[in-house]
């Protein structure tokens, strides 16, 4: 039977969501509870390490939300953004693979605000490279496992 | 070793983004620089030609952005849309496979506006069929390779 | 030749879209017309039944739209949401796998409004489990087959 292909589906660790409105690399994800799972890949300090060269489909879903009971939003005009970043350890460098998001005005009369971003794409990844997620306004992240997650699965070998 | 399955990840050619607010088929994509790549598929005049029958996962990520230093937006109420289109050459016809987007009011007090769309789906494609991307308001496209791209990878054969 | 892997791409049945602004499980999808197709999975009462254990990539694209000629929207502040739900029949239980959406103010001066949501993720599914789609404000759904759909394809076996 062929060796199982690498994959991961990682969900946000609600207990470790940073506060603030700055852009930040999310550093804590679950890999083994609820829908979260990982195989033939490694999770280290919030980064998803590739152990096997290949072409992978990468995806991320990031939800932001705010209820007026939490106080006011940091600014009337929010940039709610996600960046899927590839880091090469051998040659220390980081590059954005995918980005998505929207500017939002959450100063209105509504008591609840919500917005989700989804990105996905097909990338060549080498063993040792790492995938991480950066977001703006992390304090607005929705901590549910169905809301804020990212993942990867290997589709095929590199010739 | 089995033949490598077809795939493509195509990023927008920033130098060839059309101006205007009309709906247009984007005609120039990179296939061999940065994250862009192609294998066992063909790119011709902005259309992704299928060379091998199969079931493919298709995706697109389209980002729009505007900074007040670029002047005013073309309209207060924008329709920011993407359409993933399949064209059959044998019988000249075009059909929308997927669409996404949002109406936006970018006339507000913010000096920067941003919005991204992501669509994806699983489709049966035949050799000779072509996939292209139509957008509204092309002059607002984000030209970064992590922002505006589309792609496909073959998942399995047609029985 | 290996058995074809399970897949489905299901498009909304325009004739059966419920009215109202409440959250509802969409109960009628096409599986055999236009882009819709299914293989080694089963569609029953709007739920996509898994017949074969495996890791699947699941996705959904949901479009909402409103034209002023249809009358006013149910409320100024809309929650336009989608939930991809897994139901286990053996142990009757339902869990959200993915969610996405946005709060929207569609009370403005524009005569047309549109918004799309896309979600996707990689999940372990067991034979007998079912996937369904819940949305808020179903009366605002775009009934086109390129607009409102969901699907799944098996990526690999469970070891």
């Amino acid at each position: 039977k062929p060796e199982a292909q690498p994959f991961a589906h990682l969900t946000i660790n609600a207990a470790s969501i940073p506060s603030g409105s700055h852009k930040v690399t999310l550093s804590s994800w679950y890999h083994d509870r609820g829908w979260a799972k990982i195989s033939n890949m490694t999770l280290s300090n919030g980064k998803l390490r590739v152990n096997q060269d290949g072409f992978y489909y990468l995806y991320a879903n990031i939800c932001f939300r705010h209820h007026e009971t939490s106080g006011s939003v940091p600014t009337d005009y929010l940039q709610l953004m996600v960046y899927v970043v590839k880091t090469s350890i051998k040659i220390p460098s980081s590059h954005n693979l995918m980005k998505g998001g929207s500017t939002k005005n959450w100063s209105g009369n509504s008591e609840f605000h919500f917005y989700s971003i989804n990105v996905g794409g097909f990338f060549k990844l080498r063993a040792g490279e790492e995938i991480s997620i950066q977001v703006s306004n992390p304090s607005l992240l929705d901590p549910d496992q169905d809301a804020t997650y990212f993942g990867a699965f290997k589709v095929q070998d590199i010739d | 070793k089995p033949e490598a399955q077809p795939f493509a990840h195509l990023t927008i050619n920033a130098a060839s983004i059309p101006s205007g607010s009309h709906k247009v088929t984007l005609s120039s994509w990179y296939h061999d620089r940065g994250w862009a790549k192609i294998s066992n598929m063909t790119l011709s005049n902005g259309k992704l030609r299928v060379n091998q029958d199969g079931f493919y996962y298709l995706y697109a990520n389209i980002c729009f952005r505007h900074h007040e230093t670029s002047g005013s937006v073309p309209t207060d109420y924008l329709q920011l849309m993407v359409y993933v289109v399949k064209t059959s050459i044998k019988i000249p016809s075009s059909h929308n496979l997927m669409k996404g987007g949002s109406t936006k009011n970018w006339s507000g007090n913010s000096e920067f506006h941003f919005y991204s769309i992501n669509v994806g789906g699983f489709f049966k494609l035949r050799a000779g069929e072509e996939i292209s991307i139509q957008v509204s308001n092309p002059s607002l496209l984000d030209p970064d390779q992590d922002a505006t791209y589309f792609g496909a990878f073959k998942v399995q054969d047609i029985d | 030749k290996p058995e074809a892997q399970p897949f489905a791409h299901l498009t909304i049945n325009a004739a059966s879209i419920p009215s109202g602004s409440h959250k509802v499980t969409l109960s009628s999808w096409y599986h055999d017309r236009g882009w819709a197709k299914i293989s080694n999975m089963t569609l029953s009462n709007g739920k996509l039944r898994v017949n074969q254990d495996g890791f699947y990539y699941l996705y959904a694209n949901i479009c909402f739209r409103h034209h002023e000629t249809s009358g006013s929207v149910p409320t100024d502040y809309l929650q336009l949401m989608v939930y991809v739900v897994k139901t286990s029949i053996k142990i009757p239980s339902s869990h959200n796998l993915m969610k996405g959406g946005s709060t929207k103010n569609w009370s403005g001066n524009s005569e047309f409004h549109f918004y799309s949501i896309n979600v996707g993720g990689f999940f372990k599914l067991r034979a007998g489990e079912e996937i369904s789609i819940q949305v808020s404000n179903p009366s605002l759904l775009d009934p086109d087959q390129d607009a409102t759909y969901f699907g799944a394809f098996k990526v690999q076996d469970i070891d």
Epitope: - | P18, V24, T25, S27, G46, K47, T75, T87 | E111
Partner: antibody, heavy 116, light 108 residues
Framework: QSVKESGGGLVTPGGTLTLTCTAS????????MSWVRQAPGKGLEWIGY?????SPYYANWAKGRFTISRTSTTVDLKMTSLTTEDTATYFC?????????????WGPGTLVTVSL | DMIQTPASVEVAVGGTVTINCQAS??????LAWYQQKPGQPPKLLIY???TLASGVPSRFKGSGSGTQFTFTISDVECTAAATYYC????????????FGGGTEVVVK
């Protein structure tokens, strides 16, 4: 569905004229509209377009002297500093409904003559 | 801008006529063809380089992409006598004219 231009006629060089486009059978306010002109015995010349709620775009040669604007029921073309070279039939045309820059419904045209 | 050739062409009833349109830079498949008869406004025949507009007979055919486009009328009838124009529908930047110069088709 149809459109109709009005406001054409005789104007002296250096003058100003505003043409008006009205529609029946559809709403002008949610359709893109172009203006095109045709000098006697010559080809078609695109002037510019305007999208719903939006700012207009113009051909290079039309920038500055030509202004496209819209109300809820009309799309107007204002022409200033007219010369004899501007003598032409002026057409307004509705774009295809999906927003492409393809001109689907044309009016019969209105003749503008610039002469002393 | 769009270069259209020939400026005029004669064709016999039942014959075939071909008109070419060249864009100065790639416009993908963003091209339309129009028919105009004397005293009438133009009529959209083809858009997206090859898609027939509603109600247009299949003897009208468009092809090409990038910078080279072709318009063909086969099995020509007397009613095909008209002037035909191509129009790029890609970008409005630096446009002097979106239309080609036109081709007069004379049916013998």
């Amino acid at each position: 569905q149809s459109v109709k231009e009005s406001g054409g006629g005789l104007v002296t060089p250096g003058g100003t004229l505003t043409l008006t486009c009205t529609a029946s059978g559809f709403s002008l306010s949610n359709n893109a509209m172009s203006w095109v002109r045709q000098a006697p015995g010559k080809g078609l010349e695109w002037i510019g377009y305007i999208y719903p709620g939006g700012s207009p775009y113009y051909a290079n040669w039309a920038k500055g002297r030509f202004t496209i604007s819209r109300t809820s029921t009309t799309v107007d073309l204002k022409m200033t500093s007219l010369t004899t070279e501007d003598t032409a039939t002026y057409f307004c045309a509705r774009h295809v409904s999906d927003g492409g820059w393809y001109l689907y419904i044309w009016g019969p045209g209105t003749l503008v003559t610039v002469s002393l | 801008d769009m270069i259209q050739t020939p400026a005029s062409v004669e064709v016999a009833v039942g014959g075939t006529v071909t008109i070419n349109c060249q864009a100065s830079q790639s416009i993908g498949s963003n091209l339309a063809w129009y028919q105009q008869k004397p005293g009438q406004p133009p009529k959209l025949l083809i858009y997206g380089a090859s898609t027939l507009a509603s109600g247009v007979p299949s003897r009208f055919k468009g092809s090409g992409s990038g910078t080279q486009f072709t318009f063909t009328i086969s099995d020509v009838e007397c009613t095909a006598a008209a002037t035909y124009y191509c129009q790029q529908a890609y970008s409005i930047s630096n446009v002097d004219n979106a239309f080609g110069g036109g081709t007069e088709v004379v049916v013998k």
